[in-house]
Interface confidence: low
């Protein structure tokens, strides 16, 4: 129903704590360079205003839309043009154009320093002094680096962070309690970020229909006992929630997500037998739990899919009379039978089925034409299955770091024009798929691998869009989202690339590398590896292995030497010479 004051309505629904957290996330995602203090001040002003509207919905400006209220706040920030350049031009526009303008200026790769975690003692001190400010800093720092992070889920991660600190700061050895737990939350949050960015890309580039198809497939896999009407309702609601979050309407998004969780818990009987554990939890944990709940047991008596979609003589009539509904039921029926497939694969199969009906239903004998459609799915299914087997075998042989290096070589050869930092980031993320997915049971590997790779490649596309340099990447990123991963997999060495000339300074290292954390050391070595491939794109795996082994040996020797600086300055040039010779 319509409310006299939208801001009062959301404040009442969400409660002060969540309201403030979401407003802080919204401001941090829009204006990514502002300090925490600047945003905290705005949040307090907005919250105070919301309270006046709760007290009197007819008070001045309480009837204004949230976009108008928030936009006016952002546009009142001093020195907006000096700090944000052309983003300040958005403030000359009226709603809804102004909000659209803000959205277009969100930066997926802001030039902010990495989010460094303070050491345990310092963290615990500031957490104990002021938990609210501490968590506010966390929300602000994550949100500004990830401008499309799913806001209600970020509140969940902040809650996790809070619980870990409460527990570990009471321990004697704070460091060893905090580190593994916070690393776990960080890893999950980063995966959540790329997954949500993929959803927003789907919504932005291909509209609600594309996202809804994704949701139907995903929900049908998870809830195979729910009927199509139920799945359609859930998919519609989930699409609305994601549309709101991707559009910056974070209060509405969080409110509607809570409503959806409530609906699911009140209708478990018609949705799934696996929801009770989630439904017993408090709000943020409940919604998070529902989003990754295990698949329900598939009904035992499901008839063959062919009965309705191939053998039925009325297929073309059913298709013609209600295309979206008919294709929707196909996607539902196929997905509920295949929890072992990735959503991307299911959408490719639905697309193939649609194309087949478009072609066959215009022919003289449609059943003869579409009769083989299920057999034609086979190559589409085999391709990702082979990808999983090949890559998981390689991961098991090389381990995560070695697997990342193999991917780095592969992708640098496919798109050598892409900047080295982007290639290294992509390869490291793609390489984590091994640890994340290859250890899972066989039937869970394919959905895990392909849907994760698709999300990472979406980030590659977003970064490449800012500065397009590779025709290969442009080609793969221009197609539909579900075809991206197969497109990237099919790329071979870019024959148009003119190799980079060898620069000794690229491969010159100093003793400061010895004190870097292991992760930073790996990044330095992987940066060198990418540069080697850019210099010799057709170097064999054997040649590259020789050089990298030599390089690792050099680092090990010099970092153990009594006089590290001398070792690096004398042995370094020898290493460079040996590298050139090995690749000649």
């Amino acid at each position: 129903e319509a409310h006299k004051s939208e801001i009062a309505h959301r404040y009442n629904d969400l409660g002060e704590q969540h309201f403030k957290g979401l407003v802080l996330i919204a401001f941090s995602q829009y204006l990514q360079k502002c300090s925490y203090d600047e945003h905290a001040k705005l949040v307090q002003e907005v919250t105070d205003f919301a309270k006046t509207c709760v007290a009197d919905e007819s008070a001045a400006n309480c009837d204004k839309s949230l976009h108008t209220l928030f936009g006016d706040k952002l546009c009142a920030i001093p020195n907006l043009r000096e700090n944000y350049g052309e983003l300040a031009d958005c403030c000359t526009k009226q709603e809804p154009e102004r909000n659209e303008c803000f959205l277009q200026h969100k930066d997926d790769n802001p030039s902010l320093p990495p989010f460094e975690r303070p050491e345990a003692e310092a963290m615990c001190t500031s957490f104990k002094e002021n938990p609210t400010t501490f968590m506010g800093h966390y929300l602000h720092e994550v949100a500004r680096r990830h401008p499309y992070f799913y806001a209600p889920e970020l509140l969940y991660y902040a809650e996790q962070y809070n619980e870990i600190l409460t527990q570990c700061c009471a321990e004697a050895d704070k460091e060893s309690c905090l580190t593994p737990k916070l690393d776990g939350v960080k890893e999950k949050a980063l995966v959540s970020s790329v997954r949500q960015r993929m959803k927003c890309s789907s919504m932005q580039k291909f509209g609600e229909r594309a996202f809804k198809a994704w949701a139907v497939a995903r929900l049908s896999q998870t809830f195979p006992n729910a009927d199509f009407a139920e799945i359609t309702k859930l998919a519609t609601d989930l699409t609305k929630v994601n549309k709101e979050c991707c559009h910056g309407d974070l209060l509405e998004c969080a409110d509607d997500r809570a409503e959806l969780a409530k609906y699911m818990c009140e209708n478990q009987a018609t949705i799934s037998s696996k929801l009770q554990t989630c439904c017993d939890k408090p709000l943020l944990k409940k919604a998070h739990c529902l989003s990754e709940v295990e698949h329900d047991t598939m009904p035992a008596d499901l008839p063959a899919i062919a009965a309705d979609f191939v053998e039925d003589q009325e297929v073309c009539k059913n298709y013609a009379e209600a295309k979206d509904v008919f294709l929707g039921t196909f996607l539902y029926e196929y997905s509920r039978r295949h929890p072992d497939y990735s959503v991307s694969l299911l959408l490719r199969l639905a697309k193939k089925y649609e194309a087949t009906l478009e072609k066959c239903c215009a022919e003289a004998n449609p059943p003869a034409c579409y009769g083989t459609v299920l057999a034609e799915f086979q190559p589409l299914v085999e391709e990702p299955k082979n990808l999983v087997k090949t890559n998981c075998d390689l991961y098991e042989k090389l381990g995560e770091y070695g697997f990342q290096n193999a991917i780095l070589v592969r992708y640098t050869q496919k798109a050598p024009q892409v900047s080295t930092p982007t290639l290294v980031e992509a390869a490291r993320n793609l390489g984590r798929v091994g640890t994340k997915c290859c250890t899972l049971p066989e039937d869970q590997r394919l959905p895990c691998v392909e849907d994760y790779l698709s999300a990472i490649l979406n980030r590659v596309c977003l970064l490449h869009e800012k500065t397009p340099v590779s025709e290969h990447v442009t080609k793969c990123c221009s197609g539909s989202l579900v075809e991206r991963r197969p497109c990237f997999s099919a790329l071979t060495v870019d024959e148009t690339y003119v190799p980079k000339e060898f620069k000794a300074e690229t491969f010159t290292f100093h003793s400061d590398i010895c004190t870097l954390p292991e992760k930073e050391k790996q990044i330095k070595k992987q940066t060198a590896l990418a540069e080697l491939v850019k210099h010799k794109p057709k170097a064999t795996a054997e040649q590259l292995k020789t050089v990298m082994d030599d390089f690792a040996q050099f680092l090990d020797t010099c970092c153990k030497a009594a006089d590290k600086d001398t070792c690096f300055s004398t042995e370094g040039p020898n290493l460079v010479t040996r590298c050139k010779d090995a690749l000649a």
Partner: nanobody, 126 residues
Framework: EVQLLESGGGLVQPGGSLRLSCAAS????????VAWFRQAPGKEREFVAG????????YYADSVKGRFTISRDNSKNTLYLQMNSLRPEDTAVYYC???????????????????WGQGTLVTVSS
């Protein structure tokens, strides 16, 4: 389990009208794809009209399009078939059928419906 019970059949003159009802129990009628079929003496059972579950999209056999209207009343858990401009060739036993938990679209293939009513006879004659 879904139980279906048809009513409303009878004798009617050509050009006349009849309204058939099908009361469902055991499952909500809006959650399942439902359809009307008919069987004339000595002939195969044929699809007449259907309506999707959760999606109010209707389907009709070419022979009844424009004359028959399928609808449902969710509050009464009942399916209807409004038959106008009746012809002698519409004479048959009319059956109501349901297919829950399958695609929520109607199929025109009788074998795909697990639940059936006992039928109601419609005779069109002068």
């Amino acid at each position: 389990e879904v139980q279906l019970l048809e009513s409303g059949g009878g004798l009617v003159q050509p050009g006349g009208s009849l309204r058939l009802s099908c009361a469902a129990s055991g499952r909500y009628i809006d959650e399942t794809a439902v359809a009307w079929f008919r069987q004339a003496p000595g002939k195969e059972r044929e699809f007449v009209a259907g309506i999707g579950g959760g999606v109010d999209i209707t389907y009709y056999a070419d022979s009844v399009k424009g004359r028959f209207t399928i609808s449902r009343d969710n509050s009464k858990n009942t399916l209807y078939l409004q038959m106008n401009s009746l012809r002698p060739e519409d004479t048959a036993v009319y059956y109501c059928a349901a297919r829950p938990g399958r695609p929520q679209i109607t199929s025109k293939v009788a074998d795909l419906y697990p639940y059936w009513g006992q039928g109601t006879l419609v005779t069109v004659s002068s």
